[in-house]
């Protein structure tokens, strides 16, 4: 089966790599614009130059293209704790990241929030904090993991998943409760 190609892909596939088919004359292949530039005017004829212009401030193209407009530079989202790692240039979008001792949590493909790496208090570091993953903690005896923090088993209610890890403590609490009745 032949994969379905969009109109632009169909047109581009007729021309050699680095060229695209003229939108008004499919017998002409025009040279694509370099990254950092955009298409101002198609080439007038075979072997003639495409009119490419440099992207204006606040916009970019990261690869060769025949776009009529450059792409707008991304802005780092302060409300998500993001900081700018590198500024936008004509051929590269802004790069956003997190501060030291923080990791990125992706809520969706193009949205991340910065959170502090867990310190594993009352536990040990099983896996160190990574760029896109929090520290993995192993809790000491008498503690269980809740929201990536080691919490005392005295906070474990019977209905919670912690009961297996905190079983001796739960039994002790139950025993104490029973012995207090008359």
């Amino acid at each position: 089966l032949v994969p379905h190609l969009g109109d632009r892909e169909k047109r581009d596939s007729v021309c050699p790599q680095g060229k695209y088919i003229h939108p008004q004359n499919n017998s002409i292949c025009c040279t694509k614009c370099h990254k950092g530039t955009y298409l101002y005017n198609d080439c007038p004829g075979p072997g003639q130059d495409t009119d490419c212009r440099e992207c204006e401030s606040g916009s970019f193209t990261a690869s060769e293209n025949h776009l009529r407009h450059c792409l707008s530079c991304s802005k780092c989202r302060k409300e998500m704790g993001q900081v700018e790692i590198s500024s936008c240039t004509v051929d590269r979008d802004t790069v956003c990241g997190c501060r030291k001792n923080q990791y990125r949590h992706y809520w969706s493909e193009n949205l991340f929030q910065c959170f502090n790496c867990s310190l594993c208090l009352n536990g040990t570091v099983h896996l160190s904090c990574q760029e896109k993953q929090n520290t993995v903690c192993t809790c000491h005896a008498g503690f269980f993991l809740r929201e990536n923090e080691c919490v005392s088993c005295s906070n474990c209610k019977k209905s919670l998943e912690c009961t297996k890890l905190c079983l001796p403590q739960i039994e002790n609490v139950k025993g104490t409760e029973d012995s207090g009745t008359t």
Partner: nanobody, 119 residues
Framework: EVQLLESGGGLIQPGGSLRLSCAAS????????MVWVRQAPGKGLEWVSH????????YYADSVKGRFTISRDNSKNTLYLQMNSLRAEDTAVYYC????????????RGQGTLVTVSS
């Protein structure tokens, strides 16, 4: 005590519009970034939109961009979501929430309002 109460959901035909509201109390609303998330039947939570304290540069998921508009009225402690050109795939329970601070979970989220898009 933080309270978030959503309203405005209901049954709507494809192409129709709805406006969701979220009444907030128990915290300084004007100091918080607010979020709309949704959960379609049998699926996980999806981040729909968020708006910072002053309402600048709101974020929209690609699936709702150009159709939904988030806004807030800090004097009324209320968050809104205007939903236009609704589609069947927008059917979900919509929750308003405070932007998480400690980790990737919602400490404060409302009970939700059901939006059903069907003919």
């Amino acid at each position: 005590e933080v309270q978030l109460l959503e309203s405005g959901g209901g049954l709507i035909q494809p192409g129709g519009s709805l406006r969701l509201s979220c009444a907030a109390s128990g915290f300084t609303f004007a100091h918080e970034t607010m979020v709309w998330v949704r959960q379609a039947p049998g699926k996980g939570l999806e981040w729909v939109s968020h708006i910072d304290r002053v309402g600048q540069d709101p974020y929209y998921a690609d699936s709702v961009k150009g159709r939904f508009t988030i806004s807030r009225d800090n004097s009324k402690n209320t968050l809104y979501l205007q939903m236009n050109s609704l589609r069947a795939e927008d059917t979900a329970v919509y929750y308003c929430a405070l932007l998480p601070k400690r980790g990737p979970w919602f400490d404060y989220r409302g009970q939700g309002t059901l939006v059903t898009v069907s003919s």
